[in-house]
Interface confidence: medium
């Protein structure tokens, strides 16, 4: 049998006749910034080119004994996980290693920066195909390291990093906290977050997804045929770097935004036991375990969206929180969430020529989060239509009046400290799906988009009696772009999207009472793109879709038990 | 990449008195900021990344680095430029005393300065 981690990232089998074995990442170069490596290990021999880059600090301690096998241990294992002959994810990928960590696994921010600059210069001197950079390291939050990662990402490089092994918020570490980097947490064979001694995988909004990171069999630097089991978020990041290499080899033109959306889309959803995470981090942490796509083509027709949480606003009365999408993504909706329920809603606003989602704290509130729904929508033209608070008892409403524009999201923002629950709930009149409705004392913001073939519909789920959570999901083939609550009353803590489900959270039932005033409706806006579907069908007509996971059929034969040399 | 525009002592002579050297505020009235690792044991004081504003050219980076060295030397401090960045971020890596940070933050083109810190295999 193949190792559990490789099985876990392999999608369920499709019919054999739909598949052609892929090249396993052969068009992609993966740069590894780590310790030195044992490049003549049979797992990676001929697959890894050791560059002359080395920038490491002196080892600590006067009695430190430099032993080659220990110096090479971390990097060799990771190179094996990415592209190893037997236990690797992307067996066709070629790698280049840079030494930025010493024999004790320690490096510096400055050394890492110079390494990233080296990669950029190499890319300019000799442009090759897609580049993936694996950063299986972490330090404290660093503005300069994050900035360098941002620049490299904007130059078209895919950066994958370890979330960190500190059982802490990944946003406190770098490069994990850099938004442009794909940050990976670690899970085990039971889909539990990985515990490492007294610590474990990092978590929180800066993590993009999780991947296998416990008891991972890979190349050992003890001998050229040895294998060893290692654990950590580095191993998890190496899996995602391998998956990214496979995806980019199949579709070399994928942008970073497209790759990230695909990684999220093809991940296993809601399999992680969230009880392991601190309570306040559960809602922020993505419940996603990375997996290879079932086939190399056929994903193009989908409208991909992801949820981006802001940092916490902090408790001051006028505090705000801002959530942003990546440069290539469109902000299709904006919502907010506060654990105390004291918030003043959210609005979409332009910042630097791009829409952002801003949430507002309220007096006595412990702070808010802004939640952006970020989507890939080529040739989109989106704008925000705003209606000021209405005096009429019917409430405030706004719709998309431009021809060809469809409603993708609704936001509401109010200046009053407490909207109160005494007003009757406002219901949307039937037959007017293209409008947002809200409380009469709130201003309402509609996100209206025009894109080829884009169509959207509104889906609601109302519960008359108060409940802590109301959800509504988009059906197969449709993608959730907007998620909001109707009406925006004070007992609603907020709304946010989890995958294709809109979640509206309310205050604890016991504190709300069970009157009709507690009624809450979750409103989902579900969209799809007929244009993307059509383009994809045309593409599939001329290209036979080849499957990514056939490589693992061959691998089942390749994998031999006698390679297991545990230490 | 080698340091281009000659040695910097001539710059020292060109500057005015000991006091007025680099006290001028950076352009646009914006103040450069200093950052360091929140985790104290991971800090590496004595080595700093001086990040310059986005459109700064390599020659300006080198000039700014030499200017810092000249100013530092006049105050009895040694500085060593370990690297000049270009390609990703403009700036330079410098080994110097933390006493010089205030001076360095006032250099023209400086966006922010970050103290070096450790990173670890995960």
């Amino acid at each position: 049998s193949i190792p559990w981690n490789l099985e876990r990232i392999t999608p369920p089998r499709y019919r054999a006749d739909e598949y052609q074995p892929p090249d396993g990442g052969s068009l992609v170069e993966v740069y590894l910034l780590d310790t030195s490596i044992q490049s003549d290990h049979r797992e990676i021999e001929g697959r890894v080119m050791v560059t002359d880059f080395e920038n490491v600090p002196e080892e600590d301690g006067t009695r430190f004994h430099r032993q080659a096998s220990k110096c090479d241990s971390h990097g060799t294992h990771l190179a094996g996980v990415v592209s190893g002959r037997d236990a690797g994810v992307a067996k066709g990928a070629s790698m280049r290693s840079l030494r930025v960590l010493n024999c004790q696994g320690k490096g510096t921010v400055s050394g890492t920066l110079i390494g990233l600059e080296f990669i950029r210069k190499s890319q300019l001197v000799q442009p090759v195909g897609p580049l993936v950079v694996l950063l299986p390291l972490a330090g404290g939050y660093s503005r300069v390291l994050n900035a360098a990662c941002q620049r490299l990402a904007r130059a078209g490089v895919v950066l994958v990093t370890a979330a960190g092994n500190f059982r802490d918020d990944a946003c406190l570490y770098s490069p994990a906290s850099a938004p442009e980097v794909i940050t990976v947490g670690a899970t085990n064979a039971q889909d539990q977050p990985v515990t490492l001694g007294t610590l474990g995988t990092n978590f929180g909004r800066c993590v993009d997804l999780f991947a296998p990171g416990e008891d991972i069999i890979g190349a050992s630097s003890d001998c050229s045929t040895c294998f060893v089991s290692q654990s950590g978020t580095s191993q998890a990041a190496a899996h995602v770097a391998g998956i990214a290499a496979m995806m980019l080899s199949a579709e070399p033109e994928l942008t970073l935004a497209e790759l990230r959306q695909r990684l999220i889309h093809f991940s296993a959803k809601d399999v992680i036991n969230e009880a392991w995470f601190p309570e306040d981090q559960r809602v922020l942490t993505p419940n996603l375990v990375a997996a290879l796509p079932p086939s190399t083509h056929g994903a193009g027709w989908q409208l991909f969206c992801r949820t981006v949480w802001s940092a916490h606003s902090g408790p001051t009365r006028m505090a705000t929180a801002v959530a942003r999408c990546a440069p290539d993504e469109e902000l299709l909706s904006c919502s907010s969430f506060s654990r105390s329920g004291k918030r003043r809603g959210e609005r979409m606003e332009a910042q630097g020529g791009k829409l952002v989602c801003r949430a507002h704290n309220a007096f006595g509130g412990e702070g808010v989060y802004a939640i952006a729904r970020c989507c890939l929508l080529p040739q989109a033209n989106c704008s925000v239509h705003t209606a000021p608070p209405a005096e009429a008892s019917m409430g405030t409403r706004v719709h998309c009046h431009q021809q060809g524009h469809v409603l993708t999201g609704c936001s509401s923002h109010w200046e009053v400290e407490d909207l109160g629950t005494h007003k009757p709930p406002v219901l949307r009149p039937r037959g007017q799906p293209n409008q947002c409705v809200g409380h009469r004392e709130a201003s309402i913001h509609a996100s209206c988009c025009h894109a080829p073939g884009l169509e959207c519909k509104v889906k609601e789920h109302g519960i008359p009696a108060p409940q802590e959570q109301v959800t509504v999901a988009c059906e197969e083939g449709w993608t959730l772009t907007g998620c909001s609550a109707l009406p925006g009353t004070s007992h609603v803590l907020g709304a946010y999207a989890v995958d294709n489900t809109c979640v509206v959270r309310s205050r604890d039932v016991s504190t709300t009472g069970s009157t009709s005033e507690g009624a809450v409706t979750a409103v989902a806006i579900c969209c799809r793109s007929r244009h993307l579907a059509q383009a994809s069908q045309e593409l599939q007509g001329s290209t036979s879709g080849s499957g990514l996971n056939d490589i693992f059929e061959a691998q089942k034969i390749e994998w031999h038990e006698h390679h297991h040399h545990h230490h | 990449q080698e340091d281009e525009d000659g040695d910097y002592e001539e710059l020292v002579l060109a500057l005015r008195s000991e006091e007025d050297g680099l006290a001028e505020a950076p352009e646009h009235g914006t103040t450069a900021t200093f950052h360091r690792c929140a985790k104290d044991p991971w800090r590496l004081p004595g080595t700093y990344v001086v990040v310059l504003k986005e459109e700064t050219h390599l020659s300006q980076s080198e000039r700014t680095a030499r200017r810092l060295q000249a100013q530092a030397a006049r105050r009895g401090y040694l500085t060593k430029i370990l690297h000049v960045f270009h390609g990703l971020l403009p700036g330079f890596l410098v080994k110097m005393s933390g006493d010089l940070l205030e001076l360095a933050l006032k250099l023209p083109h400086v966006d922010y300065i970050e103290e070096d810190s450790s990173v670890f295999a995960q």
């Epitope: 490491v56 002196e58 | 990449q1 006049r74 401090y77 040694l78 060593k80 370990l82």
Partner: antibody
């Protein structure tokens, strides 16, 4: 122990180039700058420049700037100094030295044994 | 360039003598001065750094002083192994420069 071992003596003709190597051991090569200093027969010491092995950043004495190249190979912990367009007055012993820096204290704490370069027609 | 003028260029002394060598910088180099000892056919060895700090393993008879432009190396009681050439170096400004050297010979 910490040491710098240089390549052997060289005899060159005027106009030729010479490349001297300096192999470091007993410490992390990329952690310290390597300087090159020369000493003509019966003369004093003359600083030529330095390389930061961790980033390849170099700084030269203006006197040698157009003729000197400093490189390194981290895989074998070796620094190189190449001097081109040799003249007879380049006949000297060439030393590499490691520079230690801590606080505001700087010095050359380890020196290579020296490489004699003779330029003669 | 900063010129380091070392004097005397040579001196003769006996074992047990107190020997003083001076170095004058053409401009302020603060305390960024090191002193080295060199024996014939050998590479220089560090004695003093930052004008007055004795390097590890250097006998206590060697001491340094000075700041700004005037620096002194003192050997309090000359020993047979101390007969050599001594150089000062400034590290305040590029290019680093050395004094011309002082040869200490047996009287």
């Amino acid at each position: 122990q910490v040491q710098l071992v240089q390549s052997g003596a060289e005899v060159k003709k005027p106009g030729a180039s010479v490349k001297v190597s300096c192999k470091a051991s007993g410490y992390t090569f990329t952690g310290y700058t390597i300087h090159w200093v020369r000493q003509a027969p019966g003369q004093g010491l003359e600083w030529m420049g330095y390389i930061n092995p961790s980033s390849t950043y170099t700084k030269f004495n203006q006197k040698f700037k157009d003729r000197v190249t400093m490189t390194r190979d981290t895989s074998i912990s070796t620094a190189y100094m190449e001097l081109s367009r040799l003249r007879s007055d380049d006949t000297a012993v060439y030393y590499c030295a490691r520079e230690r820096i801590y606080s505001n204290y700087w010095f050359f704490d380890v020196w290579g044994q020296g490489t004699t370069v003779t330029v003669s027609s | 360039d900063i010129v380091m003028t070392q004097s005397p260029s040579s001196l003769s002394a006996s074992v047990g003598d107190r020997v003083t060598i001076t170095c004058k910088a053409s401009q302020n180099v603060y305390t960024a001065v090191a002193w080295y000892q060199q024996k014939p056919g050998k590479s220089p060895k560090l004695l003093i750094y930052s004008a007055s700090n004795r390097y590890t393993g250097v006998p206590s008879r060697f001491s340094g002083s000075g700041s700004g432009t005037d620096f002194t190396l003192t050997i309090s009681s000359l020993q047979p192994e101390d007969f050599a050439t001594y150089f000062c170096q400034q590290l305040s400004s590029y290019p680093y420069t050395f004094g011309g050297g002082t040869k200490v010979e047996i009287k």
